[in-house]
């Protein structure tokens, strides 16, 4: 956020940029949390995303029995590895075809024991506040489907009739990692020393990191004719004075007519 300064007062302004603001020759360049001519004002909303999508990664091991292991399979750039990768990927795409969150598989290692395939199953979902539940459900379906296929697609009389065959006992889920996204935590961190006063509110399933000085939310502070300003002790209403009234009170809701006050004083004098 930037505010431009013109005229003779600019040199003075340069040395007075506050809150880590820097002078660029024309104006104070303010850090994310501040705005105003001197970066003296605290913003009332902070952009915290969210990311468009959230990902999960499942580390799995399956044992493929329909391919005999050769040393070349250890070399990821070999013709053998590339072909195995293509067939395995195609097979897994079939296995997981009913899972909307499924993105693909990534083979990390092939080792001896028929062919033991260490791989990641990659999942992704659009961000919603329920993303954890969505991905948890998807990982459960992955487990069910891989268990089913490695039980059904097995060698009979040392021959496989399917695209790939598996060892039923060789299927293991090692680890599940979900990208963590915690809007409340992000909001608190980005608000720094004002973290106690910023909260997350949702609108159309999108999180907004706001202080009570941001209008239009359930936590918004109504300062009436005054201006909401954030300080280290929290949001405060700065009350205005008009030609006819003084305003006071915590929400600037108490108006005192100047003429009455002047009239009163005049009466005393």
């Amino acid at each position: 956020r930037t505010t431009t300064c013109f005229g003779d007062g600019c040199q003075n302004t340069a040395s007075r940029c506050k809150n880590g603001g820097t002078w660029d020759g024309l104006k104070c360049q303010c850090p994310n949390l501040y705005y105003g001519e001197l970066c003296e004002e605290v913003v009332s909303s902070i952009d915290i995303g969210p990311p468009e999508t959230i990902s999960a990664q499942m580390e799995l091991t399956v044992t493929v029995t329909s391919v005999k292991f050769t040393e070349e399979l250890k070399n990821h750039s070999s013709q053998e590895f590339q072909e195995f990768k293509q067939t395995f990927t195609e097979q897994m795409n079939i296995v997981y075809s009913g899972i909307p969150e499924y993105v693909g598989v990534n083979i990390t290692k092939l080792r001896l024991g028929s062919v033991v395939v260490e791989h990641d199953v990659l999942l992704r979902t659009k961000y919603t506040p329920e993303y954890k539940t969505v991905l948890d459900n998807a990982t459960e379906v992955v487990k069910e489907k891989i268990t089913k296929v490695t039980t059904q697609q097995i060698m009979i009389n040392d021959i496989c009739s399917d695209m790939m065959c598996f060892n039923t006992t060789g299927t293991q889920v090692q680890n599940i990692t979900v990208t963590q996204y915690d809007p409340e935590e992000d909001c608190r961190k980005m608000a720094k020393e004002y973290g106690d006063y910023f909260v997350v509110e949702y609108r159309d399933q999108k999180p907004y990191c706001i202080s009570p000085c941001e209008p239009g939310f359930s936590v918004s502070k109504n300062c009436n004719l005054g201006k909401c300003q954030m300080s280290l002790s929290g949001p405060q209403c700065l009350c205005v004075t008009t030609e006819t009234h003084w305003y006071s009170g915590e929400t600037c809701n108490q108006g005192t007519q100047k003429s009455l006050v002047y009239g009163h004083h005049h009466h005393h004098h």
């Epitope: 013709q79 053998e80 072909e83 060698m155 009739s161 695209m163």
Partner: nanobody, 124 residues
Amino acid sequence: DVQLVESGGGVVQPGGSLRLSCAASGYTSNRYSMAWFRQAPGKEREVVAFIWTDGGRTYYADSVKGRFTISHDNSKNTLYLQMNSLRAEDTAVYYCAASSLLLQTINPRAWPYWGQGTMVTVSS
């Protein structure tokens, strides 16, 4: 990339013999799998036989056991199928297939490389 070219198809009388050949090129290793599949009109493609070029394994479909012989000449990188005692039901397009892996599957989807096919007709 791996290329496969079949030859040797033709018309033969029941009880007769035929020898199919398949020349392979593009392999980086001398140990891989090769197979013969066939597809009769209106039917699905099915395995006839496969072989590992290191001599480690051969497989035959029950319908051709004792009549057909699969072999591979490493020096020529060529696959053969010797077909004896041919029957009318052997009539089909015969395809050569290959994989750089040592495959033990008879499912065509596992085999990535294919020739264009050669027609074998057994008829009197």
